[in-house]
Interface confidence: medium
């Protein structure tokens, strides 16, 4: 396990002529945010393929307004690193995708608009634990400067974060319920300090202040033997090996949740469901009243006037948990109406709308016939999220407001004269010509050069184009 870290140093117009002055142009103020996506291997993957190694989103940068006369600056950037945790081995070879997004803040129909400003995709080789790698990339007329690295999280070490190291304080022999494993590194640098009193023999920690029990032991300090352990039978002659692994040490082993909280495993970690009156990562915060503001994300706190009475958080739509601390998987609710594409950016939800729709959730049907009059007797026809006006004869244009002059294109051939008619146009042919558009010459002997049965025209028909 480890973390990929990306630091954006600058983003701005690239050198040379034709470079944009600003991402905002005349649109009003805007701000930037970045998205990083990691894909394994060096294969050229489709842009839509998942970010299998992980993805992260930056906060939004400061608001930027273009100064018309000022030189084009580097743009104000969001603070902090972008961090992408990875659970498994670091692959060494990977595809790095960095997207720069623009959020336009000017007043407009549908509210702030988000658009992808630049996207760089690079295949890279990188060993975990190495120094920061620096890079400059161009994306269209933009230039992005950034650094990145991969680092392991203890107890994992090595270029792929696959070797485990033993804290200096750890025992050098296998404890109960442990099976032999590949030798561990001799020492970790900066080992975490476990909870005071945590058994050196039967407990371990990956984060300061915790005490997680080896298989076969329990209790807050891992001092209490479990009467039956499925792992004890694993011990054998080779169990004196200096390196030991907990056989799949579950994150919930020894129940890290305090105060009666129940533990459930999540990928690479755990989650505590706390009883009322307690919260925190391990339900370690207690004696909470409504005055302490225990309800997150706009939850409404009820009861809990004193530490002895329980409070209840009434969560707003979109949040759940005893303290409204858990966000509902928002895209699973299909919040983007009318076929819009949902993007959960973490700090916000975005919808990419189909043509004809707008608004934060694509709820605004721009081409709805309702209230959209087609002028001059035209009728509105809806279909597939779009509308069009079917205009009465003699009228045209998007809303049938334009008077159509059927004679404007000079449709009558051979000097025929065109007359606009309520149902189209009429050609008055010059001597020697006939047909709806005066296109046929009349032979001197009076016999028409028409085919025997011209489609849609019989001798004697009025010469009118419908």
């Amino acid at each position: 396990a480890g973390v990929f870290e990306l630091q954006i140093h600058s983003f701005g117009p690239g050198p040379g002529p034709g470079a944009p002055r600003s991402p905002c142009s005349a649109r009003g103020p805007c701000r930037l945010f970045f998205r990083v996506c990691l894909k394994p291997g060096l294969s050229e993957e489709a842009a839509e393929s998942p970010c299998a190694l992980g993805a992260a989103l930056s906060a939004r940068g400061p608001v930027y307004t273009e100064q018309p006369e000022a030189p084009a600056p580097d743009l104000p950037l969001p603070n902090g690193l972008l961090q992408v945790p990875f659970r498994d081995a670091w692959p060494g070879t990977f595809s790095l995708i960095i997207e720069t997004w623009r959020e336009e803040l000017g007043d407009q129909i549908g509210g702030p608009a988000w658009s992808l400003l630049a996207r760089v995709t690079r295949r890279r080789r990188l060993a975990a634990g190495g120094p920061w790698a620096r890079d400059i990339q161009r994306a269209g007329a933009w230039e992005l400067r950034f650094s990145y690295r991969a680092r392991c999280e203890l107890p994992a070490v090595g270029t792929a974060c696959t070797r485990l190291c033993r804290p200096r304080s750890a025992p050098s022999r296998c404890g109960p319920g442990l099976r032999p494993c590949a030798p561990l590194e001799d020492e970790c640098e900066a080992p975490p300090v476990c909870r005071a009193g945590c058994s050196l023999e039967h407990g371990f920690c990956e984060q300061p202040g915790e005490c997680r029990c080896l298989e076969g032991w329990t209790g807050p300090l891992c001092m209490v033997p479990v009467s039956t352990s499925s792992c004890l039978g694993l011990r054998g002659p080779s169990s004196t090996t200096t390196g030991c692994l907990v056989p799949g040490p579950g994150p919930c082993d020894g129940n890290p949740c305090a105060n009666g909280g129940s533990c459930s495993e999540t990928p690479g970690s755990f989650e505590c469901t706390c009883p009322r009156g307690f919260y925190g990562l391990r339900c370690e915060v207690s004696g909470v009243t409504c005055a302490d503001g225990p309800c997150f994300n706009g939850g409404l706190c009820v009861g809990g006037a004193d530490p002895d009475s329980a409070y209840i958080c009434h969560c707003p739509p979109g949040f759940q948990g005893s303290n409204c601390e858990k966000r509902v998987d928002r895209c699973s609710l299909q919040p983007c109406r009318n076929g819009g594409l949902c993007l959960d950016l973490g700090h916000a939800l975005r919808c990419r709308c189909r043509a004809g729709f707008a608004g934060p959730r694509c709820e605004h049907d721009l081409d709805d016939c309702a209230g959209r009059a087609c002028a001059n007797g035209g009728t509105c026809v809806e279909g597939g999220g779009a509308h069009r006006c079917s205009c009465a004869l003699g009228f045209g244009g998007r809303n049938c407001r334009e008077r159509a002059d059927p004679c404007a294109a000079r449709p009558c051939a051979h000097g025929g004269r065109c007359y606009a008619h309520f149902s189209g146009l009429v050609c008055a042919c010059a001597p020697g010509y006939m047909g709806a558009r005066c296109e046929f010459p009349v032979h001197p002997d009076g016999v028409s050069a028409l085919p025997a049965a011209p489609p849609g025209l019989r001798p004697g028909d009025p010469q009118r184009y419908l």
Partner: antibody
Amino acid sequence: EVQLVESGGGLVKPGGSLKLSCAASGFTFSDYGIHWVRQAPEKGLEWVAYISSGGYTIYYADTVKGRFTISRDNAKNTLFLQMTSLRSEDTAMYYCARGDYDDIFYTMDYWGQGTSVTVSS
Amino acid sequence: DIQMTQTTSSLSASLGDRVTISCRASRDITKFLNWYQQKPDGTVKLLIYYTSRLHSGVPSRFSGSGSGTDYSLTISNLDQEDIATYFCQQGNTLPWTFGGGTKLDIK
């Protein structure tokens, strides 16, 4: 406790103007979109207007478009509805209602008690 | 605009009854259907959002179901305090529209 308190209603002549206010408390006002909804006497509920948390997205019902203006002052936790060119059919109880946190559902999860507007000569 | 129709404008039932109120949309609203209760004093409360999700603080005797264009609100064990008018509202496409309401009283 979430509270929304409307004010500013009253009797006004046709063609006249009125400005309604909605004072919010008990939640982070700047995190939520807010709706105005009205109810004519002995009738159902009719959505009137909506403004997003930051004020960037504004929507109106066709019946009030061009006559009503919704706005908000996040520093003062207050929502406004400026009504002009009032007609007799605008006579109703006007409610402000809080939208949901992420505008996923477009619910109105907490409502004020309403303020009455009567348009009559 | 999407029209919301509550065919039953008033309904009488006995205490303890199971009551179902229906609502139909003029086109598919993809489950973005909310139910509100308006008490005789004019107080309005959200009961159910997104077709079937119970709003916080609402008794569990209220439930919602439906999809596409047809939706319903069920009160499983009618209580005296449930005397009110119930409105459905679609949150799928602007403008947001309400049903005409169903007034519920006790037999």
